[in-house]
Interface confidence: low
């Protein structure tokens, strides 16, 4: 038997992936554990092996199908269980009835690119990845720009309260190296959270023209 507090948290990427993290205070030694997903109204089920991510937490991704296939809807409920092997048996360590569209975390935005750059401004675009068509335009974004001598945590957040897959950064310093990141969140879902930040996009503003005020 395993003592200690257990936390089992999962998010749906809105298409064909459920990512789960299981934390257990009373750490398990050399025990094989899995997450099992059983939808209430579908004929498939899926499992993934929990792999350690720290001393007392494990994670895995339930791959439900092709990345852009719509495997679950707003009416689905998926019974998720953590099962750990105890000798020849499997023991249920945690269980939840998971409502996928109440627990959303989308994939990080991709394909970031500089559309146009000047001395003081830069226009950047991106794409969302594996996001359900159910959202239509009901998405919001946060963006941040890393300036020289600062950290990401210090970067002010820019909020885009609509599905706008571009931004025009202004009041930049000429001939300066910057990095840019963006993340996305659906408006739907009581426990929905922000996607991971995108991979940083590095860009450099143009130098100021010689002999002109900047």
């Amino acid at each position: 038997a395993v003592n200690g507090t257990s936390q089992f948290t999962c998010f749906y990427n809105s298409r064909a992936n459920i990512s789960c993290v299981w934390s257990q205070d009373g750490a398990l030694q050399d025990t094989s554990c899995q997450v099992h997903a059983w939808p209430d109204r579908r004929r498939w089920n899926q499992t993934c092996e929990l792999l350690p991510v720290s001393q007392a937490s494990w994670a895995c991704n339930l791959i439900l199908g092709a990345p852009d296939s719509q495997k679950l809807t707003t009416v689905d409920i998926v019974t998720l269980r953590v099962l750990c092997r105890e000798g020849v048996r499997w023991r249920v360590m945690a269980i939840q009835d998971f409502k996928p569209f109440e627990n959303l975390r989308l994939m990080a935005p991709i394909s970031l690119q500089v559309v146009h750059v000047e001395t003081h401004r830069c226009n950047i675009s991106w794409e969302i990845s594996q996001a359900s068509h159910y959202f239509e335009r009901h998405l919001e974004f946060e963006a941040r720009t890393l300036s020289p001598g600062h950290t990401w945590e210090e970067a002010p957040l820019l909020t885009l309260k609509q599905k706008q897959e571009w931004i025009c950064l202004e009041t930049l310093t000429p001939d300066t190296q910057y990095e840019f990141q963006v993340r996305v969140k659906p408006l739907q879902g009581e426990f929905t959270t922000w996607s991971p930040w995108s991979q940083p996009l590095a860009f450099r503003t143009k130098p100021a023209a010689l002999g002109k005020d900047t």
Epitope: Q34, H36, W38, D40, R43, N45, T79, R81, L83, V88, W90, V92, I95, D97
Partner: nanobody, 123 residues
């Protein structure tokens, strides 16, 4: 290899109660929808009750509805059949069945079966 072992059968008077248990070994219990069937002498095996993997959904044959309750304990790899208000016509060998497909659980030829436990209800 999946194995099912039933227990809890016996002789009981009409109006009495029995609780059958069925333990699954050899695979992950929560993969399976579980069911109870019965076969009276000279009759075909018939579906009695089933419970889905999560325990969320149960199903009963009309003749036992309200008298029998099927349940499962996923920590103990065991499914139960609580039988109350037993009648002489409930006399049969009771079989436990397992199937990974909920929609096939009533199918006699696609289930994994236990060896059965005798229930006799005397009047």
């Amino acid at each position: 290899e999946v194995q099912l072992v039933e227990s809890g059968g016996g002789l009981v008077q009409a109006g009495g109660s029995l609780r059958l248990a069925c333990a699954l070994s050899g695979d992950v219990f929560v993969r399976y929808t579980m069911a109870w069937f019965r076969q009276a002498p000279g009759k075909e095996r018939e579906f009695v009750a089933s419970v889905t993997d999560s325990g969320r959904t149960t199903d009963y044959v009309a003749s036992v509805q309200g008298r029998f309750t099927v349940s499962r304990d996923n920590n103990k790899n065991t499914v139960y059949l609580q039988m109350n208000s037993l009648k002489p016509e409930d006399t049969a060998v009771y079989y436990c069945a397992a199937n990974t497909d909920y929609f096939q659980i009533r199918s006699l030829d696609r289930n994994t079966w236990g060896q059965g436990t005798q229930v006799t209800v005397s009047s």
